[in-house]
């Protein structure tokens, strides 16, 4: 869009935002936000929701790919009126229930939820969020928290993943855009390369899988590498190693030549699986090459 | 293959009490949300109740509250729904089915409960 | 909370596309399942999420959900269709689901 960083993870993305009374003087900063963030998502394979939440929950925009409805969805964004109690959990809620949805598909897409709120939550709403973001963690989702203004860090650090999944933003909704650079550096998780792109039919190879955001799992030791052969069979791998811009994991044995081989990486031991356009093909290698 | 099968069900007075049970097979039981939804002769279906996958949540329409109670004991893969109070307009086919997020993807053949004097 | 009205009954010819409607204020932000009903059976869920197909559902089974209206359409329609649909919705935890108040198919 403008030159800045990018993300170009195939995964769904949910935005769950508070429009609750206390944010009605910065919902122009949240939508800002919000915009300018889900124009980095760049990759064709990523989907998009936007929630809001105040005294329920509202999916204002159902998870879609389709850029033209994004637009329409930041459209509607645009025109919030904030307004009542902050219930955060019926924002996991309305996730959660795509997720479920979505799962019962059978193929499970990664799933990535950038929550926002201002202002500290009450015993019981706090407990309900918490509760709730456990439940989208349980159907395979990662959970981002961002904090403004009045926020508690400890009560987000539990309904994120963990402290490193919250972003504070402690001088207030201007200040939102600042963070807008570290929020996609550590939210994005994508597969850029794999190295070599090309193996030889039936014989073992290990391969390198380039990209960023490997290291974000809540536990590294669930990171599989997945290949789905011929758009069909998929084969699961555990890598040999996890760093934060590439895996090291063994090839899957392609007999014939031709073959085709979609990557895959999954962040939580194969629940759900982050997609992408890089492709390992087969080739018919002379003895000696 | 995965299946719902209820009982319990009969003829009660009104302020009367039943408890039906559904027995699951077929999938991992722990893993599912469970509800109860009604439906009373010649009439629409209507929910009743949801618990949660572990039990610890439940839910329940404003119509029952109060009289009815949803358990379930995942060790015997069963689901219950303990109706205090009956009432003539409790007088349904009760369908007990797996759920998730208001989805019911598989449902019981149902059970008939009749409140009469 | 939300309420959902469906049409007491729908006609349609053998073959012939029918298209069973389901309404709500601002229905398009929720989502839609619709199950069929057969005479002295349980219901079958048939779309979940709008428009979704559960495994063993035939294709011509199909739905949508736009601006405050749900649609169950079901094209080349066979006789073994003829049954009360039910559209619903969920509320949330704190209201449950709630479910529309039936259509009954008739093929004629």
């Known amino acids: 869009e403008d030159g800045g960083p990018a993300c170009y993870g195939g995964f769904d993305l949910y935005f769950i935002l508070d429009k609750s009374g206390s944010v009605l003087h910065h919902w122009n900063e949240i939508y800002y936000f919000v915009e300018q963030l889900a124009h980095r998502f760049i990759s064709p394979q990523l989907r998009m929701s936007f929630i809001v939440f105040s005294t329920r929950g509202t999916t204002l925009m159902k998870l879609t790919e389709d850029r033209e409805q994004i637009r329409q969805g930041l459209e509607e964004l645009q025109k919030v009126l904030p307004g009542g109690d902050t219930y955060m959990h019926e924002g996991f809620e309305r996730a959660s229930e795509q997720i479920y949805y979505e799962n019962s598909q059978g193929y499970r897409t990664a799933s990535v939820i950038i929550a926002l709120t201002d202002g500290e939550l009450h015993e019981d709403l706090f407990f309900y969020s918490e509760r709730e973001a456990n439940r989208s963690r349980d159907l395979g989702a990662i959970v981002y928290c961002v904090g403004v203004k009045d926020f508690n860090e400890t009560q987000l650090a539990r309904i994120a993943d963990s402290k490193d999944h919250v972003f504070p933003v402690n001088d207030g909704f201007q200040a939102l855009q600042g963070i807008i650079h570290s929020i996609l550096k550590k939210s994005c998780i994508e597969i850029l390369a794999a190295e070599p792109s090309t193996i030889c039919a039936g014989e073992s190879f290990q391969v390198v899988v380039r990209g960023n955001g490997f290291r974000h799992a809540r536990n590294v030791d669930r990171v599989l590498c997945s290949f789905k052969i011929n758009d069909s069979v998929t084969l699961n791998e555990k890598p040999f190693a996890v760093e934060d811009t590439y895996l090291l994991c063994p090839a899957p044995i392609l007999k014939e030549v031709g073959m085709k081989a979609a990557l895959q990486v999954s962040m939580n031991d194969g629940l759900s699986f982050i997609s992408s356009s890089v492709i390992i093909t087969t080739t018919h290698c002379s003895d000696g090459s | 293959q995965v299946q719902l099968v209820e009982s319990g069900g009969g003829l009660v007075q009104p302020g009367g009490s039943l408890r039906l049970s559904c027995a699951a097979s077929g999938f991992t039981f722990n893993s599912y949300g469970l509800s109860w939804v009604r439906q009373a002769p010649g009439k629409g279906l209507e929910w009743v109740s949801n618990i949660s996958s572990n039990g610890s949540y439940t839910y329940y329409a404003d119509s029952v509250k109060g009289r009815f109670t949803i358990s379930r004991d995942n060790s015997k893969n069963t689901l219950y729904l303990q109706m205090n109070s009956l009432r003539a307009e409790d007088t349904a086919v009760y369908y007990c089915?797996?759920?998730?997020?208001?989805?019911?993807?598989?449902w019981g053949q149902g059970t008939l409960v009749t409140v009469s004097s | 909370d939300i309420e959902l009205t469906q049409p007491p009954s729908v006609s349609v010819a053998p073959g012939q596309t029918a298209r069973i409607s389901c309404s709500g204020d601002k229905l398009r932000e929720y989502y839609v399942h619709w199950y069929q009903q057969k005479p002295g059976q349980a219901p079958v869920l048939v779309i979940y999420?709008?428009?979704k197909r559960p495994s063993g559902i035939p294709e011509r089974f199909s739905g949508s959900n736009s601006g405050n209206t749900a649609t169950l359409t079901i094209s080349g329609t066979q006789a073994e269709d003829e049954a009360d649909y039910y559209c619903?919705?969920?509320?949330?935890?704190?209201?449950?689901?709630?479910f529309g108040g039936g259509t009954k198919l008739t093929v004629l």
């Open positions: 619903s919705s969920w509320a949330g935890s704190r209201s449950g689901t709630v």
């Open positions: 089915a797996r759920a998730g997020y208001g989805l019911f993807d598989v």
């Open positions: 999420g709008d428009n």
